[in-house]
């Protein structure tokens, strides 16, 4: 058993039929010694008496808010949560496996630049009695500070018969060094509590590996005289690290016909303009990627040829 | 050429070669995201790798103030990786394919280090750790880790030279 926060405790249980469970001793936080009784949640019955209460925790019915009382007064509370371990593996019932980029990916994180700011998100089908708490650091043995905000519900989607809820959190490394080569990964730890179930999820990454620039901005077409060619121009997204001479991007320009089956013409360039042939009913799209490190491409920015 | 006394390197040549290094490093090990190498016990492998750290002056401001600190750190790293790529980690079993980019990568590391420090000038170089894995699978894993680490290192070096070529070239 360990303390998650004040008056909230997590009991770690091996979860299998007829598991012995854990004996837990709760102590009433009071100088009083006599006449103390205990209740569980909204029970009218007294579960035990005395300054300490020994309980056998085997299932979710044993978890909950234990309250000690004396003479009609509440003295203190202890909320017990359960963390299940099945076949040596901690349960992951609360969050959905996003399966990208690999199986057992529950947390996904992205950064728009090298400033040390990043966003993580996760999915669940649970809509109520759900709380998240996020902590992060750079490295784990001698951790350096990363400050995370509160996790918020950022999207709701309908997936077949189920509703899916997306939560996200923004974090900022306290003393970020955008130009340095990272040697210690960022660690992100999410505590998830659903009713009386506790789970924790972790992700470890370098900012460089989760970079995904915003799409290029101000995408424009300039027809060239007496030609089917157009000059496409664009600019670095506002959110990208500066100076651009140091934090450079490379770009992919694509000409795509109306039908998805039509052949796509692609041009790669380090410049912020390119000359392409504009076909009727086609569209021109441009996306960006770090020039020197192959992290994710941005989403496409698009304009119609006409 | 970079002279330890403090003259400027051939920024544009360094830029071109470092960008080529980036391309080669990624073609030598393109499996980004498919194999989480940090799960495989990093300790002895990459702890001794020279990283370009915050205080090494490789940021735009540091380069403007005095690029020598940064160039020395890049040089150290290039020599370190050049030695690693020439060691039995890469020359031993399992043999690299004949068309593997590792050979070109090795030569380009040497080329860039020589651009930074011509014959007869000596910056301190870092001692290469004695990494001699016994099993072929260990060697393979070590190669992946070294290449992943090299990708991060050459990305920073390429940024330094790109910025230098754009803003510090005479």
């Amino acid at each position: 058993i360990w303390e998650l926060k004040k008056d909230v405790y997590v009991v770690e249980l091996d979860w299998y039929p007829d598991a012995p469970g854990e004996m837990v001793v709760l102590t009433c936080d009071t100088p009083e010694e006599d006449g103390i009784t205990w209740t569980l949640d909204q029970s009218s019955e007294v579960l035990g008496s005395g300054k300490t209460l020994t309980i056998q925790v085997k299932e979710f019915g044993d978890a909950g808010q234990y309250t000690c009382h004396k003479g009609g007064e509440v003295l203190s509370h202890s909320l017990l949560l359960l963390h299940k371990k099945e076949d040596g593996i901690w349960s992951t019932d609360i969050l959905k496996d996003q399966k990208e980029p690999k199986n057992k990916t529950f947390l996904r994180c992205e950064a728009k630049n090298y400033s040390g700011r990043f966003t993580c998100w996760w999915l669940t089908t649970i809509s109520t009695d759900l709380t998240f708490s996020v902590k992060s650091s750079r490295g784990s043995s001698d951790p350096q500070g990363v400050t995370c905000g509160a996790a918020t519900l950022s999207a709701e989607r309908v997936r077949g018969d189920n509703k899916e809820y997306e939560y996200s959190v923004e974090c900022q490394e306290d003393s970020a060094c955008p130009a340095a080569e990272e040697s210690l990964p960022i660690e992100v730890m999410v505590d998830a509590v659903h009713k009386l179930k506790y789970e924790n999820y972790t992700s470890s990454f370098f900012i460089r590996d989760i970079i995904k620039p915003d799409p290029p901005k101000n995408l424009q077409l300039k027809p060239l005289k007496n030609s089917r060619q157009v000059e496409v121009s664009w600019e670095y997204p506002d959110t990208w690290s500066t100076p651009h001479s140091y934090f450079s991007l490379t770009f992919c320009v694509q000409v795509q016909g109306k039908s998805k089956r039509e052949k796509k013409d692609r041009v790669f360039t380090d410049k912020t303009s390119a000359t392409v042939i504009c076909r009727k009913n086609a569209s021109i799209s441009v996306r960006a990627q770090d020039r020197y490190y192959s992290s994710s491409w941005s989403e496409w920015a698009s304009v119609p040829c006409s | 050429r970079a002279v330890p006394g403090g003259s400027s390197p051939a920024w544009t040549q360094c830029q071109q070669l470092s960008q080529k290094l980036c391309t080669l490093a990624w073609s030598a090990h393109p499996l980004v995201g498919h194999m989480d190498l940090r799960e495989e016990g990093d300790e002895e492998t990459t702890n001794d790798v020279p990283h370009i750290q915050c205080g090494d002056g490789c940021d735009p401001q540091g380069l403007r103030d005095n690029s020598q600190f940064c160039l020395q750190r890049i040089h150290q790293g290039l020599i370190f990786y050049e030695k690693l790529l020439g060691s039995d980690i890469f020359t031993g079993e399992p043999s690299l394919l004949p068309d593997s980019p590792v050979g070109q990568l090795h030569a380009s590391l040497l080329g860039l280090s020589q651009l930074l420090q011509p014959e007869g000038h000596h910056w301190e170089t870092q001692q290469i750790p004695s990494l001699s894995p016994s099993q072929p699978w260990q060697r393979l894993l070590l190669r992946f880790k070294i290449l992943r680490s090299l990708q991060a290192f050459v990305a920073v070096a390429a940024r330094v030279f790109a910025h230098g070529a754009a803003t510090l070239s005479p």
Epitope: E45, G50, I55, Q56, H69, G71 | -
Partner: antibody
Framework: SVEESGGRLVTPGTPLTLTCTVS????????MSWVRQAPGKGLEWIGV?????SAYYASWAKGRFTISGASTTVDLKITSPTTEDTATYFC??????????WGPGTLVTVSS | DVVMTQTPSSTSAAVGGTVTIKCQAS??????LSWYQQKPGQRPKPLIV???TLASGVPSRFKGNRSGTEYTLTISGVQREDAAAYYC?????????FGGGTKVVVV
């Protein structure tokens, strides 16, 4: 200690109130249950009054019994006794706790 | 309400033998289960509370166990004075019910 009183012979339909008197502890800190046992039969749980003063009843006992509490007493009112209510009625403190205490019981006989 | 099904309704054991009494709850009641011993003409005496905790002054030959919604009272090394009726009491913390009882005869 816990002691029941008020048991007697009553005719069917005549309301009867049994009293459980406690000493040495505060009713604010304990739940108090009423249990009965018909002659030669098993124990039957009637209801409980909890720490907050709320009463809960077995589904068969709802409407037939009322439990209420005062400072040192807990009452069980049999609203309209029938012959099936003939039993020894026990008052018990904290039936799930290590320090649970039972009274000696009081006999109620319902007969015409 | 939770229904407590107690088995067997009666059993006999030799002195020094073992008696096992089971109570099956109709729903999950976790630790809300007590075992009582009652001798003729006496008030019930608590043996086990919270499914497995020995009540004060009760000999260690009495043991309570729970497995899911099945609760067991085991008397190991039965003594003559253990001849009595035994009842389980289970509930959800608000509404409770007794099992039908088990009469134990010591031969």
């Amino acid at each position: 200690s816990v002691e029941e009183s008020g048991g007697r012979l009553v005719t069917p339909g005549t309301p009867l109130t049994l009293t459980c008197t406690v000493s040495g502890f505060s009713l604010n800190s304990y739940s108090m249950s009423w249990v009965r046992q018909a002659p030669g039969k098993g124990l039957e749980w009637i209801g409980v009054i909890g720490l907050g003063g709320s009463a809960y009843y077995a589904s068969w006992a709802k409407g037939r019994f009322t439990i209420s509490g005062a400072s040192t007493t807990v009452d069980l009112k049999i609203t309209s006794p029938t012959t099936e209510d003939t039993a020894t009625y026990f008052c018990a403190r904290a039936t799930y706790s290590d320090d649970n205490i039972w009274g000696p019981g009081t006999l109620v006989t319902v007969s015409s | 309400d939770v229904v407590m099904t107690q088995t067997p309704s009666s059993t006999s054991a030799a002195v020094g033998g073992t008696v096992t009494i089971k109570c099956q709850a109709s729903q999950s009641i976790s630790s809300w289960l007590s075992w009582y011993q009652q001798k003729p003409g006496q008030r019930p005496k608590p043996l086990i509370v919270r499914a497995s905790t020995l009540a004060s002054g009760v000999p260690s030959r009495f043991k309570g166990n729970r497995s899911g919604t099945e609760y067991t009272l085991t008397i190991s090394g039965v003594q003559r004075e253990d001849a009595a009726a035994y009842y389980c009491l289970g509930g959800d913390g608000n509404v409770s019910n007794f099992g039908g009882g088990t009469k134990v005869v010591v031969v």
